[in-house]
C-alpha cells in the first residue's frame, strides 16, 4: 500500500492526462483526487499508464467506492478492469449491455478469465435470464460460452435467444446441455419450412428424441454423418434401417466407415442382418436371421 505523503508544489493533477505517466507512485497517490479520477475514467484507457500506476489508480477508486464502483465508472475502466479481482466484481451492479461489451473488449482474444466469468455471472443474474442480445454479445466474444453453462443455467435461456446461437457455439456442448437446448430450439424454429428448419435445428440434434428423428427421416433432410454421430445413442437405437436410410439420404454410405463407433456400432447390433444387407454396405454384426428379439426394456416397463 502506498503511504500518504503531501503532493509536491505544482504537481496537483487538474485533469487526467498523459503527464501523469511520469508521476511516481507516491505522487499519483498524493496528487490525483479520486473524485477527479472517477469523473474522467474515460481518459484512463487512452493513457499508457504503467501496471504499477494502474494499481495506484485502482487503490484510489477502491477508497472512494468501498461498496463497489458505480456503473458510470465501471463502463470506462478499460485496462484497469484487468486489475480487478472476482471479489471486487461481485460488489458491482452491471445492468447495461454497453458496459458488458466495453469490459469484454478489454479481455478480447484471451481465455475467459475468472474476472470475466464473475462479470458475466453478475450481469446475467441481474437481468434474470439470458436474453437474445446478451447471448449474442457473449457468444461473439466467447463462442464456447453457452457450453460452459450448467443444464440448470441453460434452462433460463428463453427460446427466442436461440436465434443468436451459431453452430460453432455448440461445439463443446455435452449431451446433457443439448437435452436442455434442443426443445428450446425446436420451439424457436417451429414456424420454418422443412429444409430451412433442418439447417437451423441441425446443431441442436444431439438432444433430439427418437420420435423427432423419425419425423425428420420423412422429410428428405440428408443428414451428414458428423451430425448423425453426435445424436444420442438411446435416440438412434430404435430407428429402423429404412428410417436411417431416409434420414441420411446419400450420406448413408458413410455408415461403413463408422461401423465400429457409437452410435452406429450399437445401432447395428440392434438391427436384423437381413435389413442391414439391404443397404449394400457390407455392415456386419446385426441379429442373425431366425433369432427372436426381446425388448427387455419394454418387458421391465410392463412388469
Amino acid at each position: 500500500e502506498v503511504e500518504k505523503t503531501a503532493c509536491p508544489s505544482g504537481k496537483k493533477a487538474r485533469e487526467i492526462d498523459e503527464s501523469l505517466i511520469f508521476y511516481k507512485k507516491w505522487e499519483l497517490e498524493a496528487c490525483v483526487d479520486a473524485a477527479l479520477l472517477a469523473t474522467q475514467m474515460d481518459r484512463v484507457n487512452a493513457i499508457p499508464f504503467t501496471y504499477e500506476q494502474l494499481d495506484v489508480l485502482k487503490h484510489k477508486l477502491d477508497e472512494l467506492y468501498p461498496q463497489g464502483y458505480p456503473e458510470s465508472v465501471i463502463q470506462h475502466l478499460g485496462y484497469l478492469f484487468l486489475k480487478m479481482s472476482p471479489e471486487d466484481i461481485r460488489k458491482w451492479n452491471v445492468t447495461s449491455l454497453e458496459t458488458l461489451k466495453a469490459l469484454l473488449e478489454v479481455n478480447k482474444g484471451h481465455e475467459m478469465s475468472p474476472q470475466v466469468a464473475t462479470l458475466i455471472d453478475r450481469f446475467v443474474k441481474g437481468r434474470g435470464q439470458l436474453d437474445k442480445d446478451t447471448l449474442d454479445t457473449l457468444t461473439a466474444f466467447y463462442p464456447g460460452y453457452l457450453c460452459s453453462l450448467s443444464p440448470e443455467e441453460l434452462s433460463s435461456v428463453p427460446p427466442s435467444s436461440i436465434w443468436a446461437v451459431r453452430p460453432q457455439d455448440l461445439d463443446t456442448c455435452d449431451p446433457r446441455q443439448l437435452d436442455v437446448l434442443y426443445p428450446k430450439a425446436r420451439l424457436a424454429f417451429q414456424n420454418m419450412n422443412g429444409s430451412e428448419y433442418f439447417v437451423k435445428i441441425q446443431s441442436f440434434l444431439g438432444g433430439a428424441p427418437t420420435e423427432d428423428l423419425k419425423a425428420l427421416s420423412q422429410q428428405n433432410v440428408s443428414m451428414d454423418l458428423a451430425t448423425f454421430m453426435k445424436l444420442r445413442t438411446d435416440a438412434v437405437l430404435p430407428l429402423t434401417v429404412a428410417e436411417v436410410q431416409k434420414l441420411l439420404g446419400p450420406h448413408v454410405e458413410g455408415l461403413k466407415a463408422e461401423e465400429r463407433h457409437r452410435p452406429v456400432r450399437d445401432w447395428i447390433l440392434r438391427q436384423r442382418q437381413d435389413d442391414l444387407d439391404t443397404l449394400g454396405l457390407g455392415l456386419q454384426g446385426g441379429i442373425p436371421n431366425g433369432y427372436l428379439v426381446l425388448d427387455l426394456s419394454m418387458q421391465e416397463a410392463l412388469s
Epitope: 492526462d17 498523459e18 503527464s19 505517466i21 511520469f22 511516481k24 499508457p48 499508464f49 504503467t50 501496471y51 504499477e52 494502474l54
Partner: nanobody, 124 residues
Framework: EVQLVESGGGLVQPGGSLRLSCAAS????????MGWFRQAPGKGRELVAA????????YYPDSVEGRFTISRDNAKRMVYLQMNSLRAEDTAVYYC?????????????????WGQGTQVTVSS
Amino acid sequence: EVQLVESGGGLVQPGGSLRLSCAASGLIFSTNAMGWFRQAPGKGRELVAAISWRGGYTYYPDSVEGRFTISRDNAKRMVYLQMNSLRAEDTAVYYCAAGTARIDYLSQDGYNYWGQGTQVTVSS
C-alpha cells in the same frame, strides 16, 4: 521493432549549448514514451528527459530542469534534446530510448529500444 539513431554530439565549452537529435523508425506508433539517458564513465545510466509520444508531456529530473528541453516531431519521427548552460558534469554518452512496455518510464527498465549513443564532452 523500433530503430533509433542519435546525432548532434560533440565537444562544447562550459556554458555552451548543443542540440541532440534522434531519428526513429519501425513500429514507432506502439511507443508510449521517448527518453534521453546519459552514462558518464564508471557510472550507471540516468534519465535526463522524457516525453510522452502521443501527448508531448515532458519530465526532467532536478539536475537538468530549466537547462534541458526535450521535444518531438511525430510527423518526422524525430526526438530532440536541447541542452543549454552545459557543465563539465554533463559530459557523458547520451542515448535515445523508446518505451513500448507499460513499465516505469522514469527508469531504464521502462525503455526497451535503445540507440547506439552519441558522445557529449563539456570542457574548456
